[in-house]
């Protein structure tokens, strides 16, 4: 209806004696600004006067008259929008209807607001969710339809009279729609909270109690159980009996079914609150609990650990690690099921007790080949001694041991022989798979670990072999000690240091580089003739006749070796000179005569000189002296002299006779 003023405010406001009331209010007048405002208490319209009768709590007029009540009641509004009011303090007799008489220039309006003031502070109201389940977070709400700026209050939560630890969130509303104070508490109830009293307490600013509301919690939860066992420590020996009892300490709603579990698995045909185990075996050791269900779900008791004690079972040995490499560390672990755990162990190696080893683990810091074998153990506890299990095998791997190179041939070995060697070893793990030889050669390996050297060389000194598995082990080199005839035999001149001159003392040495065996004999020969059996051949005074081709031989028990032929050269001055004449020593004049100076010299004659019967040197220096034509006056005795680097030699006289030709005789 467009003829109405528009107001917004809470329909009813609540307060109590001595508190205050704050009335949030807005309005919109039909025309213009507010000119007059009167607050009535329980107004009644008087038809006769066409005015409202009632107690005037507040009056605001143009002339500004204000009644004494003005101090208690305040109009906090304005002339066009806000009509908020405050009454402080509020009294019991303020209950009823408040009338807001509003007048503008041309229009009037009476707006009614209900005020409910109680004698004492009224209680807040606790709101709970429809269902509360254990461990599920819920929000508890405490609502009080009161809030006033001038009268601070607080809401506190209590559980069984004790303040709750959880932090509550308090909110207030002072709006045209609603006026309230609300406290919200987030809370995860446990089953133990079932049936407990929760209180929301209204307090003034000083914490003084004003009022409260209480509720009883109805926490839905799975059955809560207690398990009892006889004997109480749940430790028994095989053959003993055990009784377990399940007691329900709480269930909401009531429980429906009962069952028993061992190690999380349900035990068949066990649906009563008592579990009887007769003549228990070690297999019955484990964690037992009872399970009781209701509509919320199953509840489980705490677990009872039933220990059925027994002597150790046959043991097994675990080796870390096998196979083991020699020098590495190895750990042995004795494993035996027993209850209580074994307190003592006895260890065996290849059936023989290992002294001092009484613990679950045995540690060998450096494994050696003889540590290989079977390791077993026996475990012991208070109930007895177990049996020795089958044991575990320790395989110790190591390089081949005590490797030797062995010569198979009869000794001695001679150059050119075929030599067979074998590579032997004492032990190896894993097995030897290959062999190596040093030095390398184009040799034959007819079978694994055997080396054949065809036509063995004189210089094959030592051979070493290695036997290899995952590792190679080298033997010490073995000397072949090959025997051979003397080598590199040669003739060497010891003296003189320079060339040999006739008459010199001369020594020749028969040299060789090596011989095995070392014992040797020497032989000198010239032109097939044996000259001596020493390493040296000596000439006290060499003559040209000693020159020639010499050889020396060196022999040992294996054979003999000759040197290359060595030429002995003797240097001497020209000798045995003679003059020979051609065509003869008697030549007819006019013919040709050739005189030749013949000699024996080393080096050969380099220079000739010719002399006549008067020892007069002739102007000719070649070996031949040619007279052509020859004259009778050429007749006479001639001689020649030969010269080389060593010296000179002269010939005896040779006479040339030149006779007249028949023509000359005829002319005479």
């Amino acid at each position: 209806d467009s003829s109405k003023w528009v107001f917004e405010h809470p329909e009813t406001l609540y307060a109590w004696e001595g508190a205050c009331v704050w009335i949030p209010c807005t309005y919109r007048a039909l025309d213009g600004d507010l000119e007059s405002f009167i607050l009535f208490h329980n107004p009644e319209y008087n038809k006769n006067t066409s005015k409202f009768d009632g107690t005037r709590l507040y009056e605001s007029t143009k002339d500004g008259k204000v009644p004494s009540e003005q101090k208690r009641v305040q109009f906090l509004g304005d002339k066009n929008k806000n009509c908020t009011l405050s009454i402080h303090p509020v009294h019991l007799n303020d209950s009823g209807q408040l009338g807001l008489r509003m007048e503008s220039k041309t229009e009037k309006w009476m707006e009614r607001i209900h005020l409910n003031v109680s004698e004492r502070p009224f209680p807040p109201h606790i709101q709970l969710p429809p269902e509360i389940q254990e461990s599920q977070e819920v929000t508890l709400t405490c609502l009080l339809n009161f809030s006033c700026y001038g009268y601070p209050i607080q809401l506190q939560w209590l559980l069984e009279g004790v303040p709750m630890r959880q932090a509550a969130v308090t909110s207030t509303s002072l709006t045209i729609k609603s006026v309230f104070t609300r406290s919200e508490l987030k809370f995860s109830p446990q089953w133990s909270h079932h049936g407990k009293i929760v209180t929301c307490q209204l307090q003034d600013a000083d914490g003084k109690f004003l009022s409260n509301d209480t509720v009883q919690l109805n926490v839905k939860h799975t059955p809560k159980l207690e398990i009892k066992v006889t004997p109480s420590d749940a430790i028994v020996r095989e053959g003993d009996s055990v009784t377990m009892t399940c007691e329900v300490s709480s269930s909401n709603p009531e429980y429906t079914t009962v069952s028993w579990l061992k190690d999380g698995t349900s035990l068949k045909k066990q649906n009563t609150f008592t579990l009887n185990l007769r003549e228990v075996t070690k297999d019955q050791s484990g964690k037992y609990c009872c399970q009781v269900s209701n509509d919320v779900g199953p509840g489980r008791s705490e677990e009872v650990f039933l220990q059925v004690q027994y002597a150790p079972e046959p043991s097994t040995v675990q080796i870390l690690h096998s196979p083991a490499v020699e020098g590495s560390q190895v750990e042995f672990l004795c494993m035996s099921l027993a209850n209580p755990l074994p307190t003592n162990y006895t260890w065996y190696h290849n059936g023989k007790e290992m002294q001092g080893r009484t613990e679950e683990k045995v540690h060998i810091p450096k494994i050696l080949p003889w540590h290989a074998g079977t390791y077993s153990c026996v475990a012991e506890n208070i109930l007895g001694t177990g049996q020795r299990g089958p044991g575990a095998e320790l395989d110790v791997q190591y390089p081949p041991k005590k490797v030797t190179t062995v010569i198979q041939n009869p000794m001695p070995i001679r150059e050119g022989d075929t030599v067979t060697l074998s590579c032997n070893y004492n032990s190896s793990n894993p097995s030897v798979t290959r062999y190596e030889w040093k030095p390398h050669g184009a040799w034959e390996e007819p079978s694994l670990g055997v080396l054949k050297i065809q036509n063995v060389g004189w210089d094959n000194t030592t051979i070493a072999c290695a036997a290899c598995n995952s590792w190679c082990s080298w033997a010490s080199p073995v000397a072949l000690n090959v025997q051979y005839a003397p080598r590199d035999v040669r003739v060497r001149k010891i003296k003189p240091l320079s060339e040999i001159h006739s008459g010199n003392s001369v020594s020749l040495q028969c040299d060789f580089s090596s011989s095995h065996p070392k014992e040797v004999q020497f032989f000198w020969e010239k032109n097939g003739r044996l000259l001596g059996k020493e390493s040296q051949l000596n000439f006290d005074s060499i003559s040209p006749e000693d020159a020639g081709s010499y050889s020396c031989w060196v022999n040992n028990s294996i054979g003999q070796t000759a040197s290359k032929a060595w030429t002995l050269e003797v240097l001497y001055a020209p000798r045995r000179l003679r003059v020979s004449m051609s065509p003869g020593d008697q030549v007819m004049e006019g013919k040709s005569a050739t005189l030749t100076c013949e000699s024996d010299a080393n080096p050969p004659v380099s220079h000739y000189t010719w002399f006549d019967w008067n020892n007069q040197s002739l102007p000719y220096h070649s070996q031949k002296l040619r007279l052509e034509p020859v004259k009778v006056q050429h007749s006479g005795a001639y001689w020649c002299q030969g010269t080389n680097s060593v010296g000179k030699g002269r010939s005896p006289l040779s006479t040339l006779t030149v006779y007249y030709s028949p023509e000359t005789i005829g002319r005479r």
Epitope: H349, Q355, R357, T358, E359, P365, K366, L368, W370, H371
Partner: antibody, heavy 117, light 106 residues
Framework: EVQLQESGPGLVKPSQTLSLTCTVS????????ISWIRQPPGKGLEWLGV???????NYNSALKSRVTISKDNSKSQVSLKLSSVTAADTAVYYC???????????WGQGTTVTVSS | EIVLTQSPATLSLSPGERATLSCRAS??????IAWYQQKPGQAPRLLIH???TRQTGIPARFSGSGSGRDYTLTISSLEPEDFAVYYC????????FGGGTKLEIK
């Protein structure tokens, strides 16, 4: 590097208790057994007893009533106690490590103990 | 308790000669025997363990053999530095030393 250091008083009075300590390094007492050996002047070697890796002990039967060997693995120390000593207990005392199936290859220099009043 | 008897008590030889030292156990010691060399003022030095295994760094002239109760240490060709006291040790059942053999220069 394996090292052994025997220490203790060089002079002990007759009837008193001889106490020696062996401090080891380079290995653990949980891996090696330790034996005590002695050598009187001009005489041979005599084994006194052993403490095994697990802490058990065995002693030379001739000395069993007088000898005690103990150890502290965390301190790497082994101790020897020989009670009611006489001049015959004068010797060089060695502590030596060994393990199952392996002879003693590390010997310290030993410590000389003289029993005299 | 195992008893070890070493023989001879003294052995007089010249450098280059072969030395044979014996050790006899009162019962089978399963090859668990070691040989030590000791020089005056020094700690014993391990030569051979497990009857015949030469310790690292020990010259090849030292060798060991034997089984059961009887064991031998052989020095193939004596060097001047080999003259010392030699002890055998059994470690098959606890530990026992032999009385020693003194190897002296003839």
């Amino acid at each position: 590097e394996v090292q052994l250091q025997e220490s203790g008083p060089g002079l002990v009075k007759p009837s008193q208790t001889l106490s020696l300590t062996c401090t080891v390094s380079g290995f653990s007492l949980t891996s090696y057994d330790i034996s005590w050996i002695r050598q009187p002047p001009g005489k041979g070697l005599e084994w006194l007893g052993v403490i095994w890796t697990g802490g058990g002990t065995n002693y030379n039967s001739a000395l069993k009533s007088r000898v005690t060997i103990s150890k502290d693995n965390s301190k790497s120390q082994v101790s020897l106690k020989l009670s009611s000593v006489t001049a015959a207990d004068t010797a060089v005392y060695y502590c030596v490590p060994h393990y199952y199936g392996y002879a003693m290859d590390y010997w310290g220099q030993g410590t000389t103990v003289t029993v005299s009043s | 308790e195992i008893v070890l008897t070493q023989s001879p008590a003294t052995l007089s030889l010249s450098p280059g000669e072969r030395a044979t030292l014996s050790c006899r156990a009162s019962q089978d010691i399963n090859k668990y025997i070691a040989w030590y060399q000791q020089k005056p003022g020094q700690a014993p030095r391990l030569l051979i363990h497990y009857t015949s295994t030469r310790q690292t760094g020990i010259p090849a002239r030292f060798s060991g053999s034997g089984s059961g109760r009887d064991y031998t240490l052989t020095i193939s060709s004596l060097e001047p530095e080999d003259f010392a006291v030699y002890y055998c040790l059994q470690y098959d059942n606890l530990l026992t030393f032999g009385g020693g053999t003194k190897l002296e220069i003839k």
